[in-house]
Interface confidence: medium
């Protein structure tokens, strides 16, 4: 798995403190939880709760641990081999196309739609048209489930719980 690593992702360079474990690189790579020394001779362990590395690597620095934003809860802490796992608070969600923030879930469906999916930390509520309703003319919707809107379209509010 490859990832673009930007300068701000990297923890500030620090000299190897005495408590940091060292080992030798294997074929030029250091194991998860370590980074390589500047001279390439040693693997230096990441600092628990501060930085991490998830794969065999030749990084000069471990990656900085993510801090959960306000509006997020920490599901699991950062370890030397795994980044912090953050999740949106109840009633909010993070979309794939806008992962930078948690957004408030919508409060309900429009008339004529039913809620088929609840608010989760990764998705808004899901609303779909009532495919079984009748058209305003009194006809049953055709196979393609076409519905036309009009003031007379049968409709009832869906649950407003988020």
């Amino acid at each position: 798995e490859s990832a673009l690593i930007t300068q701000q992702d990297l923890a500030p360079q620090q000299r190897a403190a005495p408590q940091q474990k060292r080992s030798s690189p294997s074929e030029g790579l250091c194991p998860p939880g370590h980074h390589i020394s500047e001279d390439g001779r040693d693997c230096i362990s990441c600092k628990y709760g501060q930085d991490y590395s998830t794969h065999w690597n030749d990084l000069l620095f471990c990656l900085r641990c993510t801090r959960c934003d306000s509006g997020e809860v920490e599901l699991s802490p950062c370890t030397t081999t795994r980044n912090t796992v953050c999740q949106c608070e109840e009633g909010t969600f993070r979309e794939e196309d806008s992962p930078e923030m948690c957004r408030k879930c919508r409060t309900g469906c429009p008339r004529g739609m039913v809620k088929v999916g609840d608010c989760t930390p990764w998705s808004d509520i899901e609303c779909v048209h009532k495919e079984s309703g009748t058209k305003h003319s009194g006809e049953v919707p055709a196979v393609e489930e076409t519905v036309t809107s009009s003031p007379g379209t049968p409709a009832s509010p869906c649950s407003l719980s988020g």
């Epitope: 794939e96 196309d97 408030k104 919508r106 409060t107 309900g108 469906c109 429009p110 008339r111 004529g112 739609m113 088929v116 999916g117 998705s123 808004d124 509520i125 899901e126 609303c127 779909v128 048209h129 495919e131 393609e144 489930e145 076409t146 519905v147 809107s149 009009s150 379209t153 409709a155 407003l160």
Partner: antibody, heavy 118, light 107 residues
């Protein structure tokens, strides 16, 4: 980042059918959470919702246009289309495609001006 | 159908001033109201959904309030890029309808 792009002829003759396609990139049209819609805006005027479609093909139309509108979806091409029949000069507008999140339009195409003229 | 009325039609203000835009619905739409910004030659952009929730990328100076039939969009301090047309849209019932818009222009 999700992007939508309208395409089709910019000039349609009166009484003919206006046909537009919206291509979705950066995301799947087969999302269970979203409908895909068309909105139009006559020059210098406000916005009018035309209708929307679900990836399974179910459609919902504005009753003021229902007799002339067909919206369809092609999930294999990540596209959805608008057909508006028997057009008149009053159908001259910028036509936008957009994604509906529940029932607000959170991603829009840049719009395509369609002029109805002989 | 639910008719939305926006006022004023035009609002002339200077950068740095506070803008207050109104949207009134012909019947209750609960909190199911959105606000959009449209600049000349561009598509509308979602600013606020469900009356008061800021959409992704919407600056903090934009805030929405109201429920039922009366809604307000407030721009706390106008930036040069905020001069545009603002539309409200209801999603309480079908057809989805938009207000006629309020143009915010430079005094």
């Amino acid at each position: 980042q999700l992007q939508l792009q309208e395409s089709g002829p910019g000039l349609v003759k009166p009484s003919e059918t206006l046909s537009l396609t919206c291509t979705v990139s950066g995301g799947s049209i087969s999302s269970r959470s979203n409908y895909w819609g068309w909105i139009r805006q006559p020059p210098g005027k406000g916005l009018e919702w035309i209708g929307n479609v679900y990836y399974r093909g179910s459609t919902y139309y504005n009753s003021s246009l229902k007799s002339r509108v067909t919206i369809s979806v092609d999930t294999s091409k990540n596209q959805f289309s608008l057909k508006l029949s028997s057009v008149t000069v009053a159908d001259t507008a910028v036509y936008y495609c957009a994604r509906l999140s529940v029932a607000e339009f959170d991603y829009w195409g840049q719009g395509i001006l369609v002029t109805v003229s002989s | 159908e639910i008719v939305l009325t926006q006022s004023p039609a035009t609002l002339s203000l200077s950068p740095g001033e506070r803008a207050t835009l109104s949207c009134r619905a012909s019947q209750s739409v609960s909190s199911f109201l959105a606000w959009y910004q449209q600049k000349p030659g561009q598509a509308p952009r979602l600013l606020i959904y469900d009356a008061s929730n800021r959409a992704t990328g919407s600056p903090a100076r934009f805030s929405g309030s109201g429920s039922g039939t009366d809604f307000t969009l407030t721009i706390s301090s106008l930036e040069p890029e905020d001069f545009a047309v603002y539309y409200c849209q209801q999603r309480s019932d079908w057809p989805l309808t938009f207000g006629p818009g309020t143009k915010v222009d430079i005094k």
